[in-house]
Amino acid sequence: KEWQCPRTPYAASRDFNVKYMVPSFSAGGLVQTMVTYQGDKNESAVFVAIRNRLHVLGPDLKSVQSLATGPAGDPGCQTCAACGPGPHGPSGDTDTKVLVLEPALPALVSCGSSLQGRCFLHDLDPQGTAVHLAAPACLFSAHHNRPDDCPDCVASPLGTRVTVVEQGQASYFYVASSLDAAVAASFSPRSVSIRRLKADASGFAPGFVALSVLPKHLVSYSIEYVHSFHTGAFVYFLTVQPASVTDAPGALHTRLARLSATEPELGDYRELVLDCRFAPKRRRRGAPEGGQPYPVLRVAHSAPVGAQLATELSIAEGQEVLFGVFVAGKDSGPGVGPNSVVCAFPIDLLDTLIDEGVERCCESPVHPGLRRGLDFFQSPSFCPNPPGLEAPSPNTSCRHFPLLVSSSFSRVDLFNGLLGTVEVTALYVTRLDNVTVAHMGTADGRILQVELARSLNYLLYVSNFSLGDSGQPVQRDVSRLGDHLFFASGDQVFQVPIQGPGCRHFLTCGRCLRAQRFMGCGWCGNMCGRQKECPGSWQQDHCPPKL
């Protein structure tokens, strides 16, 4: 029998302890939120907020400008000064809760935990390829706001998510805030609201539409807003909240809330429970039917998918998919599965399920006992009745009221449990060629860039490397600028190439040449590298014979 070279075990063909140095910026405090801007004339910026300060960085992470956003009441606070002579309320530190781009102007909007959660608008002033912030505008009109009616009170100290949508000649802010009794009593931020930014940037228009957790539920029923995004005709919020109003706080689960992006109304507000599970190939005795539930969403991102994953998900290439990282939750008993699982929810399917749920509620034959739900926002009722009514009213439409869809959307872990003990804390998904890549940050300060494929029993790594020695968790906010992603960990912001930081972690020529084409890896004498790192021969087609 002919002798063959011994096979190198797969795990031995790569080394994830290889050190990669990626550009970074020290922000001088824990990074609270971050967003990037790419203009149409090659100007770009990274905006980074820490307590009491907002940094403007170039795409190379060099500092361009810095602005004092607090403490409120401090004479050095530059944003506070935009609101005119004070006092404007209790003094204290400003934690930035919202940092979003208003793309139509363009401008940056920041909202903090101080000064009743008001926002500031910073026009973007391009200077060559750099971007500066103009003097801030205070989006707050003192005489328009009262504790019980405050259109300009946007951010909650407990957390707020905002998505900005351009409709006609106006910008609408879709706002979702976590509340408790104390926050609700103080200048009344709302749970979910749609607010129009006034054209003169004096604040937000009055009489905005909103939903809020009812006062009687505020103590026990808290909603965490994990992510928000706009795609197609809708804005979506992702929440973690008690599964039951009556048993709250109790067990948690994850919901998707859908709002119209074309009409600033909340009558067609819909919620759907998202169910993510780990279903091992071989089910252990005593393991739950249908797989082990992972009910708590940690992070999420929506992106169009490449051809390979699209085929596996039975959808068309380029369709938008919501990816979520889920964990088991505190009360789920001793876990035998992975720490984190990743589920994929195609947006079109989500929309179809929601629309079918509306039909079930509103079209005859009426399903007896079907609840409208959302009892934490509105009076309990059965379909097709409006909230709080025992019977349908002739001049109200069943469809014009918020609804919790009666079915849930169930998916299983894309990685088949292969993330193991890894605790994912950040997620950003990109499409590269026909491949879909999940860029994940972890609780121990690492970046994992992994090809998303359903059918494999191993992880297809683009990279797996440590951002530094601090080992601090990578934060939820991830932003993209060109071919780079920006991750934050502790007080640092890191710039990570989408195609991976390098190829040196591939140890064998065979493994090197099997790397995805977009990574640009080739064999370079005795190591795997990119062409520009290679002074000698660089080979992407075949390996030298092993002697």
């Epitope: 005489h143 328009h144 003169d200 940037a201 228009a205 009055p206």
Partner: antibody, heavy 116, light 109 residues
């Protein structure tokens, strides 16, 4: 559909006052400021001022302070502009225009003629 | 107050030609600029806002550009219905009241 319907033409004597109206429909009247703009014959457009129908707050171009007074009637979704101490300089077409990034919605204009 | 200087005050062009109207602000107004078309006896029509955002339903031959203090409106391949007056407008933004440029009368050659 957003519509702004203005009152008809006015012929006034010098020294008199005139009040023109702008009735809004197709949107939430109190949610948007109402602007007023003047165009004299063959001249450019001039912004007179605006009013916030929800709170009643007004802002004026310095040139029109004391000349124009802006008010609203929320119950009828109507904005008004009164011009006082009329002179021939006030002869012009006056437009109402809804707040926005740029004024996308205009009334059809009201011609005010001041003549002895 | 911000002054808006529009040029030229008038121009004549033929159908099919391309024309450019410019507007200069006396100070930085970022992208807070709108353009209108005004015909005799009609209300102004918004063409462009935020310096370069075209209004839905406005023909694509109208395009705005610029930021800061210098702005322009370009009309490609002039059509007979494009003749009239054009105005730039410093949009309302914090602390700055709206101001119109002096206008450009576009006539048929």
């Amino acid at each position: 559909e957003v519509q702004l319907q203005q009152s008809g033409p006015e012929l006034e004597k010098p020294g008199a006052s005139v009040k023109i109206s702008c009735k809004a429909s197709g949107y939430s009247f109190t949610g948007y400021n109402m602007n007023w703009v003047k165009q004299s014959n063959g001249e450019s457009l001039e912004w007179i001022g605006d009013i916030d129908p929800y709170y009643g707050g007004t802002r004026y171009n310095q040139k029109f302070k004391g000349k124009a007074t802006l008010t609203v009637d929320k119950s009828s979704s109507t904005a008004y502009m009164q011009l006082k101490s009329l002179t021939s300089e006030d002869s012009a077409v006056y437009y109402c225009a809804r707040e926005g990034r740029g004024f996308a919605y205009w009334g059809q204009g009201t011609l005010v003629t001041v003549s002895a | 107050d911000i002054q808006m200087t529009q040029s030229p005050a008038s121009l004549s062009a033929s159908v099919g030609e391309t024309v450019t109207i410019t507007c200069r602000a006396s100070e930085n107004i970022y992208s807070y600029l709108a353009w209108y078309q005004k015909k005799q006896g009609k209300s102004p029509q918004l063409l462009v806002y935020n310096a370069k955002t075209s209004v839905e339903g406005v023909p694509s031959r109208f395009s705005g550009s610029g930021s800061g203090i210098q702005f322009s409106l370009k009309i490609n391949s002039l059509q007979p219905e494009d003749f009239g007056s054009y105005y730039c407008h410093c949009q309302h933004h914090y602390g700055t009241l709206p101001t119109f440029g002096g206008g450009t009368k576009l006539e048929i050659k």
